[in-house]
């Protein structure tokens, strides 16, 4: 069956270059036109570039024209996107997508590869407790959590009590701070009566920096 | 370039409902229109092409129609697997423009948020920064307004919000709003409050604390 396998994404500094690859199998590569489409975090789909099956026709979105170059190697069944002079606004998941026969809609898609354009360097998070108190208690339910702050790049994973606690957990999508670093909160609601007896630990893992933190969250002692 | 305008941006519906999404082109594209479905973290999936031709393997409840500049995608009887984001795409011209997307969400019953506030930890204050977190838990619909007040003065530009995806079990959302200050600024003030407005609340709910007090 048709398969498009992408590689080459990663973190890159503004102004630098990156090359994405899209390796095709399950069809005669040289007969098909393939496009690049991208999706910025939390945004819609944006068409980026196309190269015709014979290489004669290349076309680019205005936003990338003059900076990105599409190419293909039929002997390797691979399509490329060379991205130069990268900007923070180029941060997105990039997809390669194959057309159906000669009609220019996208019947087959790659799995996507994330490109992050940032001047930030890899950094592990600081993990701070969001301690339960009378201000975070409502009708027999208490809320507590962990603030996972100032890390780069995405993602971090958060579990509670090594995965034993899942009910009532909300781990929020990360926000990009003005510093260029990410921050997120993970919270859990528990019975107020359990605060004195049950231990609550958030387990934070940031693989890019090889950082693991286990933070115990307990009521503030006054 | 041909611009594609989709409406609505969000659509709340229940299983079994008939739902319709509209896509308008800024100039005629004949029937050169495709529709895609996308779920979080996944690549888009082709549903429909040439405005009304169903892609192989796509259920017949998906119905496409239209030509020229006006197009619709109808789901005749919404199924649990259909809650996703839908995009139209014109392929009449070189720039294969997409619509901005329509998110089809589960229509829940109104639930007012439970509101909690968290002061910055002593550990964080030692680092020179103070983050105050306001949590809005398990509410529906998604629209909620959070305002920060410090000694009753409205804050702007120094907070960030994040909202969860809709909960698959109870259809609610949760939101965190984080007010970030320097330690020096934090220690200049006493009363920190987040005020929450939501359609399920007859009046705004305010949660607050006095700095330094338990």
């Amino acid at each position: 069956q048709v398969q498009l396998v992408q590689s080459g994404g990663g973190v890159v500094q503004p102004g630098r270059s990156l090359r994405l690859s899209c390796a095709a199998s399950g069809f005669t590569f040289s007969r098909y036109t393939i496009h690049w489409v991208r999706q910025a975090p939390g945004k819609g789909l944006e068409w980026v570039a196309v190269m015709s099956y014979n290489g004669n026709n290349k076309h680019y979105a205005d936003s990338v024209n003059g900076r990105f170059t599409i190419s293909r190697n039929d002997s390797k069944n691979t399509l490329y996107l060379n991205m130069n002079s990268l900007r923070p606004e180029d941060t997105a998941v990039y997809y390669c997508a194959r057309i159906r026969d000669t009609a220019m809609f996208f019947a087959h898609w790659g799995q996507g590869t994330l490109v992050t354009v940032s001047s930030a360097s890899t950094k592990g998070p600081s993990v701070f407790p969001l301690a339960p108190s009378s201000k975070s208690t409502s009708g027999g339910t208490a809320a507590l959590g962990c603030l996972v702050k100032d890390y780069f790049p995405e993602p971090v994973t958060v579990s509670w009590n090594s995965g034993a606690l899942t009910s009532g957990v909300h781990t929020f999508p990360a926000v990009l701070q003005s510093s260029g670093l990410y921050s997120l909160s993970s919270v859990v609601t528990v019975p107020s009566s359990s605060l004195g007896t049950q231990t609550y630990i958030c387990n934070v893992n940031h693989k890019p920096s090889n950082t693991k933190v286990d933070k115990k969250v307990e009521p503030k002692s006054c | 370039d041909i611009q594609m305008t989709q409406s609505p941006s969000t659509l709340s519906a229940s299983v079994g409902d008939r739902v319709t999404i509209t896509c308008r082109a800024s100039q005629s594209i004949n029937t050169w229109l495709a529709w895609y479905q996308q779920k979080p973290g996944k690549a888009p999936k082709l549903l429909m092409y040439k405005a009304s031709s169903l892609e192989s393997g796509v259920p017949s409840r998906f119905i496409g129609s239209g030509s020229g500049t006006e197009f619709t995608l109808t789901i005749s009887s919404l199924q649990p697997d259909d809650f996703a984001t839908y995009y139209c795409q014109q392929y009449n011209s070189d720039s294969k423009m997409f619509g901005q997307g329509t998110k089809v969400e589960v229509k829940g019953t109104v639930a007012a948020p439970s509101v909690f506030i968290f002061p910055p930890s002593d550990e964080q204050l030692k680092s020179g920064t103070a983050s105050v977190v306001c949590l809005l838990n398990n509410f529906y619909p998604r629209e909620a307004k959070v305002q920060w007040k410090v000694d009753n003065a409205l804050q702007s530009g120094n907070s960030q919000e994040s909202v969860t995806e809709q909960d698959s079990k109870d259809s609610t959302y949760s939101l965190s709003s984080t007010l970030t200050l320097s330690k020096a600024d934090y220690e200049k003030h006493k009363v920190y409050a987040c005020e929450v407005t939501h359609q399920g609340l007859s009046s705004p709910v305010t949660k607050s604390f006095n700095r330094g007090e338990c």
Partner: nanobody, 120 residues
Framework: QVQLQESGGGLVQAGGSLRLSCEAT????????MAWFRQAPGKEREFVAI????????YYSDSAKGRFTISRDNAKNTVYLQMNSLKPEDTAVYYC?????????????WGRGTQVTVSS
């Protein structure tokens, strides 16, 4: 000035129906969400239903869903609450409220309420 005037309340037997109306005067009805709340004796005011300006988006509380229907006539500046299969626990004062933000529940204007009593 803005006034919201509810009507249509009364005494009804369990299983019966009532239709409440709320007429808005002095208010630009366009762009305004209209909601119904209720308050039973000794209890907090609770949300019942809301209808956005377009009229195509409605939301209900758990207790109202399937039995109550909210609608609006923008030409008449009026919002309605059709209440079917009424239960004794629906007994309350019903208030209409206007949310000019159409989204966030900024209920700037309230009616004085109309009493609904459901007898068993």
């Amino acid at each position: 000035q803005v006034q919201l005037q509810e009507s249509g309340g009364g005494l009804v037997q369990a299983g019966g129906s009532l239709r409440l109306s709320c007429e808005a005067t002095g208010l630009t009805f366009s762009g305004v969400a209209m909601a119904w709340f209720r308050q039973a004796p000794g209890k907090e005011r609770e949300f019942v239903a809301i209808i956005r300006w377009s009229g195509s988006t409605t939301y209900y509380s758990d207790s109202a869903k399937g039995r109550f229907t909210i609608s609006r006539d923008n030409a008449k500046n009026t919002v309605y609450l059709q209440m079917n299969s009424l239960k004794p626990e629906d007994t309350a004062v019903y208030y209409c409220a206007a949310d000019p933000s159409d989204r966030f529940g900024e209920y700037d204007y309230w009616g004085r309420g109309t009493q609904v009593t459901v007898s068993s």
